[in-house]
């Protein structure tokens, strides 16, 4: 197996790799640096493995995961001591290293000059006390969501920056607003931005308005 | 109910070869793998190789390496075991046993009722 | 391949009895560990999975455990149906191996 590559978007975490199998079979193992190597995926002819179930155990822990390639039937292809080839992956530490799932603008309510735009709080894969946690949950106030927002008539665009997941924004009365937003975590060297969110317009379902 | 009902008892010459069936009833043949597991009078178990019904990809333990073949027909759900070379330590009572889904944990949750191989000349 | 050794080879206990058998492995296996029972002309049966998850249908007198690649099984009162031989198996590496057998009887 070669191209090891880890894919995660809020946790979901597949590790996937190449090439496609004739005659071989694949088992997965994973491990943090001080832990087991537990098998996942055994003797599968696929080239992806979900590992989720692993990594949510303790998502600040740095992860590594081997692939080994097993011979179908008759093929002969073992190591010189019989033992079964394998290849490492990449090292993987969740916190640090999963994208972040493009966030949605889950409502918005104006009151005079004033907009309150509310971000949904994500559900991850990640448990506690067996409840699944939000991405807040996970990331308290290392995420930070950044609102991108404009007059329906105009293309200047303002920004936001929260620690939660709400905003108060200003705006001029009598004119129709356009939102995105964006989540954040500044601390990180990669993967610090999600892709933005849809975008939403005041006069939408999502919104309420009030003197 | 789930059962695996394997081939009646077989007696061979060292040299020869031997074949043993497992019919599978009561699930979805494709969603399990089949495991061949092996035991000798009075000794203990043997884990043969593994065989995919789904894409009839197999996997054999290396002390079997070109020796053994594991067969499958997905029309009578039906998987084979082929044991060649046949010898005198090959005696032994032979099991087809189902193991996990490929997300699933390798145990084996059922077992055929064993098939008495003997190899005497 | 990964050696599961068990121990002890036999015992004798008497009904009612806390009967204690244990594997242990080479390497670390994880939790990747299952425990069969076998009588005698009969196929194994699955007890543990996991090391220590009890399979559908097995009474809770037995039980499964882990401390490093040390595993532990336990019948907590021993009962006359109990008398069998019990293996457990690894599934962490290629091979799958079982350990040697603990041939359980009644004093």
């Known amino acids: 197996a070669f191209n090891l590559t880890w894919i995660s978007t809020d946790f979901k975490t597949i590790l996937e790799w190449q090439p496609k199998p004739t005659n071989y079979t694949y088992t997965v193992q994973i491990s943090t640096k001080s832990g087991d190597w537990k098998s996942k995926c055994f003797y599968t002819t696929d080239t992806e493995c979900d590992l989720t179930d692993e990594i949510v155990k303790d998502v600040k822990q740095t992860y590594l995961a081997r692939v080994f390639s097993y011979p179908a039937g008759n093929v002969e292809s073992t190591g010189s001591a019989g033992e079964p080839l394998y290849e490492n992956s990449p090292e993987f530490t969740p916190y640090l290293e999963t994208n972040l799932g493009q966030p949605t603008i889950q409502s918005f309510e104006q009151v005079g000059t004033k907009v309150n735009v509310t971000v949904e709080d994500e559900r991850t894969l990640v448990r506690r006390n067996n409840t699944f946690l939000s991405l807040r949950d996970v990331f308290g106030k290392d995420l930070i969501y950044t609102l991108y927002y404009w007059k329906s008539s105009s293309s200047g665009k303002k920004t936001a920056k929260t620690n939660t997941n709400e905003f108060l924004i200003d705006v001029d009365k009598g004119e129709n607003y356009c939102f995105s937003v964006q989540a954040v975590i500044p601390s990180r060297t990669v993967n610090r931005k999600s892709t933005d969110s849809p975008v939403e317009c005041m006069g939408q379902e999502k919104g309420e308005f009030r003197e | 109910q789930v059962q695996l009902v394997q081939s009646g008892a077989e007696v061979k010459k060292p040299g020869a070869s031997v074949k043993v069936s497992c019919k599978a009833s009561?699930?979805?043949?494709?969603?399990?793998?089949m495991h061949w597991v092996r035991q000798a009078p009075g000794q203990g178990l043997e884990w043969m190789g593994i065989i995919n019904p789904s894409g009839g990809i197999t996997v054999y333990a290396q002390k079997f390496q070109g020796r053994v073949t594991m067969t499958r027909d997905t029309s009578t759900s039906t998987v084979y075991m082929e044991l060649s070379s046949l010898r005198s330590e090959d005696t032994a009572v032979y099991y087809c046993?189902?193991?996990?889904?490929?997300?699933?944990?390798?145990?084996?949750?059922?077992w055929g009722q064993g098939t008495m191989v003997t190899v005497s000349s | 391949d990964i050696q599961m050794t068990q121990s002890p080879s036999s015992l004798s206990a008497s009904v009612g009895d806390r009967v204690t058998i244990t594997c242990q492995a080479s390497?670390?296996?994880?939790?990747?560990l299952n425990w069969y029972q076998q009588k005698p002309g009969k196929a194994p049966k699955l007890l543990i999975y996991d090391a220590s998850n009890l399979e559908t249908g097995v009474p809770s007198r037995f039980s499964g455990s882990r401390s490093g690649t040390d595993f532990t099984f336990t019948i907590s009162s021993l009962q006359p149906e109990d008398i069998a031989t019990y293996y457990c198996q690894q599934y962490n590496f290629h091979p799958l191996t079982f350990g040697g057998g603990t041939k359980v009887e009644i004093k």
């Open positions: 390497q670390d296996i994880s939790n990747s």
């Open positions: 009561g699930y979805t043949f494709a969603n399990y793998y």
């Open positions: 046993a189902r193991g996990g889904s490929k997300v699933a944990a390798l145990a084996f949750d059922i």
